[in-house]
Interface confidence: low
């Protein structure tokens, strides 16, 4: 296909340095369609237009990537650029409707991630949920998700809510949660690793 990718790249390359930075920051909090993960913040901030285009397409595929890019541009007040992007991607692309794309799959790694293997134990035994949320906020958790977890009354229900978002995460996102757990409750991780 490629048309949508070229249109995304064309739009991003036409942004000023300040606009590109603003685009990236908005991308961190823009609502995502269910089943899609968020590009990790650390990687995102250092990318130029070309890297960012590739990342958008690899995370969201071409059709949804273009739609998401247009949404962010529109949110920035760049309506004309958003319109041009959408027009370019709809010209005879022959793409399947955006709504039926599969979410990006986790990186191919053997077996279940530690986080998935020990889901029940983590729900029952993690006590420092606030720390985890602070660590994950803006990287893998959106504002809405962050608030939703915090709104839960108990630690287990907070963790259960947190796990409701993990099906959309890739391996890297789950690694971030594991790293946060190692830093906040290392004894728990060590205990589970031994089990």
């Amino acid at each position: 296909m490629g048309r949508a990718r070229d249109a995304i790249l064309d739009a991003l390359e036409n942004l000023t340095a300040e606009e590109l930075k603003k685009f990236k920051l908005k991308l961190l909090s823009v609502p995502l369609r269910e089943g899609y993960g968020r590009i990790p913040r650390g990687a995102l901030l250092s990318m130029d237009a070309l890297d960012l285009t590739d990342k958008l397409v690899s995370f969201y595929l071409e059709t949804y990537g273009a739609e998401l890019t247009a949404n962010v541009l529109r949110d920035m007040g760049l309506q004309e650029m958003a319109g041009q992007l959408q027009a370019a991607t709809h010209q005879g692309s022959g793409a399947a409707p955006a709504g039926i794309q599969a979410p990006p799959q986790s990186a191919a790694k053997p077996g279940l991630h530690f986080i998935d293997q020990h889901r029940a134990a983590l729900i029952a035994r993690v006590t420092n949920v606030e720390w985890l949320l602070d660590a994950l906020y803006g990287k893998v958790l959106t504002d809405e998700q962050y608030q939703a977890v915090r709104a839960e009354p108990t630690n287990p229900s907070k963790m259960r809510k947190l796990f409701s978002f993990t099906p959309a995460w890739n391996w890297t996102c789950k690694d971030l949660l594991l790293q946060a757990l190692r830093e906040s409750q290392s004894y728990l991780v060590e205990d589970l690793e031994r089990s």
Partner: antibody, heavy 117, light 111 residues
Amino acid sequence: RVQLQQAGAELVKPGASVKVSCKASGNTFNNYWIYWVKQRPGQGLEWIGRIHPSDSGTNYNQKFEGKATLTVDKSSGTAYMQLSSLTAEDSAVYYCALLSLYAMDSWGHGTSVTVSS
Amino acid sequence: DIVLTQSPASLAVSLGQRATISCRASKSVSSFGYNYIHWYLQKPGQPPKLLIYLASDLESGVPARFSGSGSGTGFTLNIHPVEEEDAATYYCQHSREFPWTFGGGTKLEIK
């Protein structure tokens, strides 16, 4: 950006308490941590603690536990910090600040608290 | 608690020259590949104003003459070229763990 409004000054007697307010404009008050910072005259900044308006969850600097109590009134979009058993050491400017992602990027203008008999 | 030591305590820089302020942490403030250090400026009678977050990210609306660098325990704020309006006290602050702490401040004077 959310604006934070604070009263200008409070004069209180030693041993008394004072309640400092911080009113947020805009309807995003419930989404962000509100932080409190102390600055004594001609001195640096000290982090007191934070409160999340959605559920009144708090984290305190141990140094200020028992001295500062953080509360919120969601209906009015106002955060409060009560300082108790005041001494001359508590004379300072107290700032509220809002953290949107990683750092405190919106600040009130500060409330000057003077403890004097 | 993590102690942040700023140096120098004060400095005077000629208009158009470079100002460099250092902030050293008593232990690493890096985690998850992020450097949890932020820089603020404060003018007399005003609240602090965020300049740089996560060691090197420029806050929206802050002039590009401000830049931050560093990782682990050592961080630097650079201002180049220095302008008249940059006369202020500069603070570093970490958010790596509770309690968050600030450096002692560096007072910048423009010659």
